[in-house]
């Protein structure tokens, strides 16, 4: 029950996180005009990953896309790439995790397969979250650098009383959305990985027993002892019959990659 809850919660948290990453990537407020020196401005500038916008006091908002690819700063391109990779990985992770959910029955899917998928999606969510956090952090660092550079030459005197004020930009709402969303996706991924441990049932330890049935040589193969890791494939010991007849409680044992995570 706790495993299902952990897995379900991990899925929901990751879903919210990925929705947030998508929202942040699409948002126009990655950087907003710094209003420290002029808290009330008639023209307000803000920029996103894909376009820059200007909102006038009149309410008129004009946005212009960055229609060049080569002319954009490499850092901006890197941030775009990180966010897109984060979204793609997150989306694939969501798809995988839907089928991995314990509460959803798909055919006769083994618990071990579900555990595999849960771990896979968990790792994808973790990487997705890290990509988003990295992307937002790179952009934030870029903003901080530019902010202090523009502060250094904030006012450029032009013949006495005429002055040109350089627009400075500070953190926009999208950065905070991105950080929170990335964190949620990361947490969701960790929860999925934890759930995976509980999903992969322990192998039962049987003592090795041999017996002879008439005309057939039959042996019980002992399950290898698992150190108590708390997870591992539920490798219920397979009885090996030469004759091919099986008893009801037979189940197959597979080596699992989860054993040594």
């Amino acid at each position: 029950m706790a495993v299902t809850a952990c897995q379900g919660l991990g899925f929901v948290v990751s879903l919210i996180g990925i929705a947030g990453i998508i929202a942040a990537t699409c948002m126009d407020q990655w950087s907003t005009q710094d209003l420290y020196n002029n808290p009330v401005t008639a023209v307000f500038n803000y920029q996103g990953l894909w376009r820059s916008c200007v909102r006038e006091s009149s309410g008129f908002t004009e946005c212009r896309g960055y229609f060049t690819l080569l002319g954009l700063p490499a850092m901006l391109q890197a941030v775009r790439a990180l966010m897109i990779v984060g979204i793609v990985l997150g989306a694939i992770g969501l798809l995988v995790s839907i089928f991995a959910l314990k509460c959803i029955r798909i055919g006769s899917m083994e618990d071990s397969a579900k555990a595999n998928m849960t771990l896979t999606s968990g790792i994808m969510f973790i990487v997705s979250g890290l990509c988003a956090i990295a992307g937002v952090s790179v952009f934030a660092n870029m903003l901080v650098t530019n902010f202090w550079m523009s502060t250094a030459n904030m006012y450029t005197g032009m013949g006495g009383m005429v002055q040109t004020v350089q627009t400075r930009y500070t953190f926009g709402a999208a950065l905070f959305v991105g950080w929170v969303a990335g964190g949620l996706t990361l947490i969701g991924g960790v929860m999925m990985c934890i759930a995976c441990r509980g999903l992969a049932p322990e192998e039962t330890n049987y003592k090795a027993v041999s017996y002879h049935a008439s005309g057939h040589s039959v042996a019980y193969k002992p399950g290898g002892f698992k150190a108590s890791t708390g997870f591992g494939s539920n490798t219920k010991n397979k009885k090996i019959y030469d004759g091919g007849a099986r008893t009801e409680d037979e189940v197959q044992s597979y080596p699992s990659k989860h054993d040594y995570v």
């Epitope: 005009q33 002029n38 009330v40 401005t41 008639a42 023209v43 500038n45 803000y46 920029q47 820059s52 916008c53 200007v54 006038e56 006091s57 009149s58 309410g59 008129f60 004009e62 212009r64 005429v162 002055q163 040109t164 004020v165 350089q166 627009t167």
Partner: antibody, heavy 118, light 113 residues
Framework: QVQLVQSGAEVKKPGASVKVSCKAS????????INWVRQATGQGLEWIGE????????YYSEKFRGRVTLTADTSISTAYMELSSLRSEDTAVYYC???????????WDQGTTVTVSS | DIVMTQSPSSLAVSAGEMVTMNCKSS????????????LTWYQQKPGQPPKLLIY???TRESGVPDRFSGSGSGTDFTLTISSVQAEDLAVYYC?????????FGQGTKLEIK
């Protein structure tokens, strides 16, 4: 079509207050910002302030801050400009105008003449 | 506050002539975000309220004759009337629409000879 109609001329004594109204029609009142500008006889234009009818946000010229109050009643699509502690130099024509793209003032009314005289 | 200075304060021209009037701001009106200059030109005929002519320094308001054109960037702007008509007799004001408080120039009075 867009139309702004202001209240009639006012004659006030120094120290009194005046409240000028500006009724808008032909558009959704909350869609546009309303600006107030005054012009003394034979003088240039002087910006008083603006009001955003949707949220009620106001911005005033420092010169008038504390003496002027801009309000809007969205139910009757009317903006108001109240100027207190009137002085003789407040004698002017008071205009309301809609702010459009480029923060340009479009659709000016004919104006309200306020005369401050003892 | 941004100070707007217009020149000349008045000028008299004959109908059909070209006229230019200047407006200088104490601070740049160019917005880096959209590369637009937030300067507006108004025409005020005697006994009438001002009428919007040009916004964003060079964008003509709809219905304004194409003989009116605006140019300039940053701090220096010009309003040009390519062929003055009798009905252009008015005072022309430039306005800073970039920063609060919005400020107007003192006006340029156009007279027809």
């Amino acid at each position: 079509q867009v139309q702004l109609v202001q209240s009639g001329a006012e004659v006030k004594k120094p120290g009194a207050s005046v409240k000028v109204s500006c009724k808008a029609s032909g558009y959704t009142f909350t869609s546009y910002v309303i600006n107030w500008v005054r012009q003394a006889t034979g003088q240039g234009l002087e910006w008083i302030g603006e009001i955003h009818p949707r949220g009620g946000n106001t911005y005033y010229s420092e010169k008038f801050r504390g003496r002027v109050t801009l309000t809007a009643d969205t139910s009757i699509s009317t903006a108001y400009m109240e100027l207190s502690s009137l002085r003789s130099e407040d004698t002017a024509v008071y205009y309301c105008a809609i702010l459009r793209r480029g923060n340009a003032m479009d659709y000016w009314d004919q104006g309200t003449t306020v005369t401050v005289s003892s | 506050d941004i100070v707007m200075t217009q020149s000349p304060s008045s000028l008299a021209v004959s109908a059909g002539e070209m006229v230019t009037m200047n407006c200088k701001s104490s601070q740049s009106l160019l917005n880096s975000g959209n590369q637009r200059n937030y300067l507006t030109w108004y025409q005020q005929k005697p006994g009438q309220p001002p009428k919007l002519l040009i916004y964003w320094a060079s964008t003509r308001e709809s219905g304004v004759p194409d003989r009116f054109s605006g140019s300039g960037s940053g701090t220096d702007f010009t309003l040009t009337i390519s062929s003055v008509q009798a009905e252009d007799l008015a005072v022309y004001y430039c306005q800073n629409s970039y920063n609060y408080p919005y400020t107007f120039g003192q006006g340029t009075k156009l007279e027809i000879k």
